[in-house]
């Protein structure tokens, strides 16, 4: 399987909410020997690979917000933690993957990946991970909703196993 | 804090089973997200990775060893033991218990227990 | 499995010396590179991981480098605490392998 990231640049004002999303591509087996762990977290773009490094989200680590379940079966993150944080991720039946951000500060600005592992009993994990860009703005220069755009066919296609 | 702790026979004859466990505290072993690992070191030697058991269960072995390891868990007590069997003289070590989230190395380390094969 | 092999196995430095460890895979691992401190009698310390990210605080003398098959640690400004064993590690696929290690001894 492959992470496709449907838009690679979200700009949003001061304030707003925005969803992050990632979508999960191709066969995804549902065995019962196998787990998928899914999580967001911060990163940089690095010279060599982008999403090497794991930076939390307001505070939280990609431990905190990952999500853990068998192949396409939905879930939510521990609601607790990370609604205190204004944070909630989450995945559906058709391997669409998101973390919702609430009140938006500058502060949100950055490079956030997505991570999907498949972990299966006696197997290497089989890892693959999206990146995208959130520019929060301030000002008259600011939208007035959050305005993506989407990634070329050619990006989404080349996220690769990590 | 995470904290790992080691304990276990630091003498085994040879052809008997090693046998040592790991106590986990300051966090849940059942936490998904998360394998429980065994790493050894001869004296004066290099670091080898024995073998995981993810928080789901499922485990991993180096196949250098596999034929002779078994890796468990006890949640209730939250714990993980490592039994080594067949012994011989080349399985002298410090023996390691370490954690290491999903895609990542190992971040904690317990503090390490010699184990001597000798008759 | 995949091997990994460090250079040099020891080397003498001074402080405030600036070291470079390398290891190298014998097949591709891309980033999937940890670096790890060991001192006498002590677990070892995970010091970088993803090739080059700084494990939460590692001062920040302490640098990775390299992708695929290559990788180095770098020490900038080398202190007395660093003197120590070095280890690199692949988590790209199972069996996890170290490097053999490399002795970092004071001058």
């Known amino acids: 399987f492959k992470v496709a990231t449907p838009y690679s640049l979200y700009v949003c004002p001061e304030g707003q909410n925005v969803t992050l999303t990632c979508r999960l591509l191709g066969p995804v087996d549902k065995g019962h020997d196998v787990t998928f762990y899914k999580t967001w977290y911060r990163s940089s773009r690095g010279e060599v690979q982008t999403c090497s490094e794991r930076r939390p989200i307001r505070n939280l680590t990609f431990q905190d917000l990952h999500l853990h379940h068998g192949g396409h079966q939905a879930a939510n993150t521990s609601h607790d933690l990370a609604q205190r944080h204004g944070l909630e991720s989450a995945s559906d039946h058709h391997g669409n993957f998101s973390i919702t951000m609430r009140n938006l500060t500058l502060l949100d600005s950055g490079l956030y990946c997505c991570l999907v592992v498949e972990i299966r009993h006696h197997h290497s994990e089989h890892r693959v991970h999206g990146a995208m860009e959130l520019q929060v703005q301030t000002g008259k220069d600011a939208p007035s909703n959050c305005v993506v755009y989407p990634s070329s066919s050619q990006d989404s296609e080349n996220i690769t196993a990590a | 804090q995470l904290q790992l702790q080691e304990s276990g026979p630091g003498l085994v004859k040879p052809s008997e089973t090693l046998s040592l466990t790991c106590t986990v505290s300051g966090g849940s072993i059942s936490s998904s997200g998360y394998y429980w690992g065994w790493i050894r070191q001869p004296p004066g030697k290099g670091l080898e990775w024995i073998g995981s058991?993810?928080?789901?269960?499922?485990?991993y072995y180096n196949p250098s060893l596999k034929s002779r390891v078994t890796i468990s868990v006890d949640t209730s007590k939250n714990q993980f033991s490592l039994k080594l069997n067949s012994v011989t003289t080349a399985d002298t070590a410090v023996y390691y218990c370490?954690?290491?989230?999903?895609?990542?190395?190992?971040?904690?380390w317990g503090q390490g227990t010699l184990v001597t094969v000798s008759s | 499995d995949i091997q990994m092999t460090q250079s040099p196995s020891s080397l003498s430095a001074s402080v405030g010396d600036r070291v470079t460890i390398t290891c190298r895979a014998s097949q591709g691992i891309s980033s999937w590179l940890a670096w790890y401190q060991q001192k006498p009698e002590k677990a070892p310390k995970s010091l970088i991981y993803?090739?080059?990210s700084l494990q939460s605080g590692v001062p920040s003398r302490f640098s990775g480098s390299g992708s695929g098959t290559d990788f180095t640690l770098t020490i900038s400004s080398l202190q007395p605490e660093d003197f120590a064993t070095y280890y690199c590690q692949q988590y790209n696929s199972y069996p996890y392998t170290f490097g053999q290690g490399t002795k970092l001894e004071i001058k």
């Open positions: 993803a090739a080059s």
């Open positions: 058991l993810y928080s789901s269960g499922y485990t």
């Open positions: 370490a954690r290491h989230p999903v895609a990542m190395n190992f971040d904690d």
